[in-house]
């Protein structure tokens, strides 16, 4: 039950996170005009990954797309790439995790397959979240660098006679959405990985060969260990051994209802 809850919660958290990453990537407010300690302009500038916008004092907003690919800063291209990779990995992760959910039955899919899929999606979510966090952080670093450069320019007067109204940019809403969304996706991924441990058998199953001192009989135990399926009394996944010597017959064996002696 706890495994199902952890897996389900991980899926939901990742879903919210990926939706947030998509929202952040599409948002125009990655950087917004700094209004503090600046000449008050009648226009408000803000920029996204795909276009820049200007809002007039009347409320009229005009946005222009970046219709060049080669003319854009390499850092911006890198941020775009990181965000897209994050979205793609997250989307694939979501698709995989839907089929991995314990509460959803698809044919005769075994728990081990679901465990593997849960782990795969978990890793994908972790990488997706890291991509988003990295992308947003790279952009934030770029903003901080440019902010202090333009602040320095403001106070050195650009060395000329004519003053310019320096437009400085600060963190936009999209950065915070991206950080939170990346964090949620990361947390969701970790939860999926934790859920995977609960889905998969913890140790390798054994068939034990018992040798008794009297030599009267040899007992084979095909049910090397009893999984917690509600059968028998062994609900703690403890191994059942008879006697001394043991031989490993199979890599994987399935829980059995009865012990054959």
């Amino acid at each position: 039950m706890a495994v199902t809850a952890c897996q389900g919660l991980g899926f939901v958290v990742s879903l919210i996170g990926i939706a947030g990453i998509i929202a952040a990537t599409c948002m125009d407010q990655w950087s917004t005009q700094d209004l503090y300690n600046n000449p008050v302009t009648a226009v408000f500038n803000y920029q996204g990954l795909w276009r820049s916008c200007v809002r007039e004092s009347s409320g009229f907003t005009e946005c222009r797309g970046y219709f060049t690919l080669l003319g854009l800063p390499a850092m911006l291209q890198a941020v775009r790439a990181l965000m897209i990779v994050g979205i793609v990995l997250g989307a694939i992760g979501l698709l995989v995790s839907i089929f991995a959910l314990k509460c959803i039955r698809i044919g005769s899919m075994e728990d081990s397959a679901k465990a593997n899929m849960t782990l795969t999606s978990g890793i994908m979510f972790i990488v997706s979240g890291l991509c988003a966090i990295a992308g947003v952080s790279v952009f934030a670093n770029m903003l901080v660098t440019n902010f202090w450069m333009s602040t320095a320019n403001m106070y050195t007067g650009m060395g000329g006679m004519v003053q310019t109204v320096q437009t400085r940019y600060t963190f936009g809403a999209a950065l915070f959405v991206g950080w939170v969304a990346g964090g949620l996706t990361l947390i969701g991924g970790v939860m999926m990985c934790i859920a995977c441990r609960g889905l998969a058998p913890e140790e390798t199953n054994y068939k034990a060969v018992s040798y008794h001192a009297s030599g009267h009989s040899v007992a084979y135990k095909p049910g090397g260990f009893k999984a917690s399926t509600g059968f028998g009394s062994n609900t703690k996944n403890k191994k059942i051994y008879d006697g001394g010597a043991r031989t490993e017959d199979e890599v994987q064996s399935y829980p059995s209802k009865h012990d054959y002696v």
Epitope: T41, V43, E56, S57, F60, E62, V162, T167
Partner: antibody, heavy 119, light 113 residues
Framework: LVQLQQPGAELVKPGASVKVSCKAS?????TYWMHWVKKRPGQGLEW???????????NYNHKFKGKATLTVDKASSTAYMQLSSLTSEDSAVYYC????????????WAQGTVVTVSA | DIVMTQSPSSLTVTAGKKVTMNCKSS????????????VTWYQQKPGQPPKLLIF???TRESGVPDRFTGSGSGTDFSLIISTVQAEDLAVYYC?????????FGSGTKLEIK
Amino acid sequence: LVQLQQPGAELVKPGASVKVSCKASGSTFTTYWMHWVKKRPGQGLEWIGGIRPSDSNTNYNHKFKGKATLTVDKASSTAYMQLSSLTSEDSAVYYCAMGAYYSNSFAYWAQGTVVTVSA
Amino acid sequence: DIVMTQSPSSLTVTAGKKVTMNCKSSQSLLNSGNQKNYVTWYQQKPGQPPKLLIFWASTRESGVPDRFTGSGSGTDFSLIISTVQAEDLAVYYCQNDYVYPFTFGSGTKLEIK
């Protein structure tokens, strides 16, 4: 068609106050900024300030802070400018102008109110 | 405050001729966000309120004759009347509508011979 109506003239005594009105018709009053501009004889135009009727957000020229107070009455689509502690320096033509939607320029102007400060 | 300096303060031209008036701002009025210059030109005829001619330095307001052309960028702007007509007798003002407080130039008075 947008129309702005102002009273033609106001005669006031020094030290007194005057409230100049500007009634808008033919457009959505709340959408656009209402600006006030001063024009003294033989001098240029001076921007006093502007008010956005939708939220009563104001922007003043620091030269007129304390002198002019801008208000709006959305119900009657009227903007007001109150001038206080009047002196002869305040004798001028006062225009109200409606801001354009697409830019910050003043698209529509009223005929202006001549304010004369005289004892 | 941004100072808008207009030149000449007055000029007299013959009808049909081309005229250019200038406006210089103390700060750049170019907005980097949209590469637009926030300069507006107004025409004020005697006994009338000002009339919007050109905004964003070069965009003609609807209904304004195409003989009026605005140009310039950064700090230097011009208003050109390609063929002056008798009805163009007026004072022309440039305005900074980028940085508060909005400021006007002192005006250029156009007289017709």
